[in-house]
Amino acid sequence: QLPPGKPEIFKCRSPNKETFTCWWRPGTDGGLPTNYSLTYHREGETLMHECPDYITGGPNSCHFGKQYTSMWRTYIMMVNATNQMGSSFSDELYVDVTYIVQPDPPLELAVEVKQPEDRKPYLWIKWSPPTLIDLKTGWFTLLYEIRLKPEKAAEWEIHFAGQQTEFKILSLHPGQKYLVQVRCKPDHGYWSAWSPATFIQIPSDFTMN
């Protein structure tokens, strides 16, 4: 029977800068029941606080609701593991909520084949930002990435769309059925999951020349 091994806070994510959750990985348990507590303070403060919510994020997590979340302030946090034989502490983790946003996938993905008479045909892709993200305030800049492939192909073709919410693709294989997905990323932060796939049948007379 031993004191617990050193835990590690390995991930923090926020859906929208208004709340966030951090997760830790326990160390070895030393063969005894182990209690974990997360404590934190904000930069410039000395007062330590305990995690406000150990439930919402699931096992080995701490959730910070709206009243505990402030932007532009670094949180300095650590996890303490304790059993009957002693304690161990994780390294301190510095967290700025602005940098840990992982948005939901973009919404309303629409794909259409456009065949104008006077120009080359193209695939037109359009989407909307995720609802939880407030782009009007200027707090967020979202970047988008599109991926598509013929249904039976193994490799995805990836296009970076920047901040725009629509995109044109010119080079496609006629007669193929394509899968199209889009994802988004804040200027600081993490890529969302890919949106559900939308399928589009490319007409056989779709000419690339």
Epitope: K11, C12, R25, T74, Y94, Y99, H188, W191
Partner: antibody
Framework: QVQLVQSGAEVKKPGSSVKVSCKAS????????MHWVRQAPGQGLEWMGE????????NYNQKFKDRVTITADKSTSTAYMELSSLRSEDTAVYYC?????????????WGQGTLVTVSS | EIVMTQSPATLSVSPGERATLSCKAS??????VAWYQQKPGQSPRLLIY???NRYTGVPARFSDSGSGTEFTLTISSLQSEDFAVYFC?????????FGGGTKVEIK
Amino acid sequence: QVQLVQSGAEVKKPGSSVKVSCKASGYTFTTYWMHWVRQAPGQGLEWMGEIDPSDSYSNYNQKFKDRVTITADKSTSTAYMELSSLRSEDTAVYYCARNGGLGPAWFSYWGQGTLVTVSS
Amino acid sequence: EIVMTQSPATLSVSPGERATLSCKASQYVGTAVAWYQQKPGQSPRLLIYSASNRYTGVPARFSDSGSGTEFTLTISSLQSEDFAVYFCQQYSSYPWTFGGGTKVEIK
């Protein structure tokens, strides 16, 4: 404890490429951005670029944009920096540096440095 | 890019005295400034982040004041281990840039 161990010194010819590695241990590699910074002999520090090892998303200093490639191998917890079209002024110590937290780009852990000498 | 200008290039100080190092940014950077210490043959070591916050384990004799474009690193009472080169760095906008350094030497 956190360690960043870099590959050994290199001597390269002008026009060639060099690839420096940085093996991370003591923490979860995918949690923190990794940066590359260089220091010419007797000179200051120059940031080259950064990578998020969780998804290999990277940003580069425009000065090096066409010549530098930063990659990360999650399976070995190793970051790489490749610099091509080497010239004599690329002679420098190259450092990998780990982001200080989940936040802005200040660097709390540094590798020991890799001296790259470019000489004909 | 934002240019960080450090002065003086060299500062001669006696042990126990106060050292004041200056760093000026060419554009507004708020408090997005870090300070590093580097000794010969070693990698840089983080001292201060967000302009005024000491990193874990950094002695209280190191402090920073300033925001916007002008920053000052103060070492209140120089110890023998403090003689080194000090760099400031901005992380307000890409590319992240460093000052040219101030060498603090024994007077």
